[in-house]
């Protein structure tokens, strides 16, 4: 049985340019201990979108909805969306390691598409 599940409930999200995009992520446990980060893209070239522990991410805010007893909310909202923000976003759990944290499990990803700003 899985020790922890990373749930990204939405396969895709479509947002008008200039609006905010909410990217949902829930986890079934805090264990194993370690940080949660958001990335755009996968593999070596992926871009870090949010890491609560360190860094400056002025367009990103955390969004915790109504708390559920059986999971933990690690959703984010990205403001002032532009076409350059399009891509697939992954919520990733890391396991605390020494000297470096180790990627433990990733969500399935949410594809963000950007619509033209309504005229």
């Amino acid at each position: 049985e899985d020790e922890l599940q990373v749930i990204q409930p939405e396969k895709s999200v479509s947002v008008a340019a200039g609006e905010s995009a909410t990217l949902r992520c829930a986890m079934t446990s805090l264990i194993p201990v370690g940080p949660i980060m958001w990335f755009r893209g996968a593999g070596a070239g992926r871009e870090l979108i949010y890491n609560q522990k360190e860094g400056h991410f002025p367009r990103v805010t955390t969004v915790s909805e109504l708390t559920k007893r059986n999971n933990l909310d690690f959703s984010i909202s990205i403001s002032n969306i532009t076409p350059a923000d399009a891509g697939t976003y992954y919520c990733v759990k890391f396991r605390k390691g020494s000297p470096d944290d180790v990627e433990f499990k990733s969500g399935a990803g949410t594809e963000l598409s950007v619509r033209a700003k309504p005229s």
Epitope: E3, I36, Q52, R95
Partner: antibody, heavy 118, light 111 residues
């Protein structure tokens, strides 16, 4: 009804060993993170050890690291705390507790008393 | 380690009145909008019982006269109105970072 029943406490001399057990029923044991928390009149509540739902990951505070070992048998719905090199300051009531999300302690057993004294 | 300072150590409140208990953490216990601070009630001879999880969420079966509030480092448990069966010791607990730590407890009595 959720039940956590601890056993194995008792009187032991400094440097000695004890093995505490916790028998779980009334919930899906294999889905829960499990922990031990102890309570002393002087120090209040103190977290002692935690194990992940599948048993792969264990965590301990510095006060017991290297002396205590936590394990579980999901087939038997049981949790075990092996305590070695016991010290007087380990004297406490030891509670078994469940954590659905590895966060708050959902349910607690009635506790078992460990006394370390010569 | 995150140190939790709980106050007051004891509290005497009249039946039907409001009881307020505070916990202050030495650093933020928030992560992604979740506040990993929880509250427990312990009556003599019994184990602790979960009342409030993640700062403000009432555990199932707990009367709604109990409520929790706060974020980052400052948290409050409120009992209003206080009933005779609420006489107990109350503890807060943080699970934001290891080692998990508890407040020293607040003993609530009837005035």
């Amino acid at each position: 009804e959720v039940q956590l029943v601890e056993s194995g406490g008792g009187l032991v001399k400094p440097g000695g060993s004890l093995r505490l057990s916790c028998a779980a029923s009334g919930f899906t044991f294999s889905s829960y993170v499990m922990s031990w928390v102890r309570q002393t009149p002087g120090k209040g509540l103190e977290w002692v050890a935690t194990i992940s739902s599948g048993g792969t990951y264990t965590y301990y505070p510095d006060s017991v690291k290297g002396r205590f070992t936590l394990s579980r048998d999901n087939a038997k719905n049981s949790l075990y705390l092996q305590m070695n090199s016991l010290r007087a300051e380990d004297t406490a009531v030891y509670y078994c507790a469940s954590q659905l999300t590895g966060s708050e302690f959902d349910y607690w057993g009635q506790g078992t008393t460990v006394t370390v004294s010569s | 380690d995150i140190v939790i300072t709980q106050s007051p150590a004891s509290l005497a409140v009249s039946l039907g009145e409001r009881a307020t208990i505070s916990c202050r953490a030495s650093e933020s216990v928030d992560s992604y909008g979740n506040s990993f601070m929880h509250w427990y009630q312990q009556k003599p001879g019994q184990p602790p019982k979960l009342l409030i999880y993640r700062a403000s969420n009432l555990e199932s079966g707990v009367p709604d006269r109990f409520s929790g509030s706060g974020s980052r480092t400052d948290f409050t448990l409120t009992i209003n109105p206080l009933q005779a069966e609420d006489v107990a010791t109350y503890y807060c607990h943080q699970s934001a970072d290891l080692p998990w730590t508890f407040g020293g407890g607040t003993k609530v009595e009837i005035k």
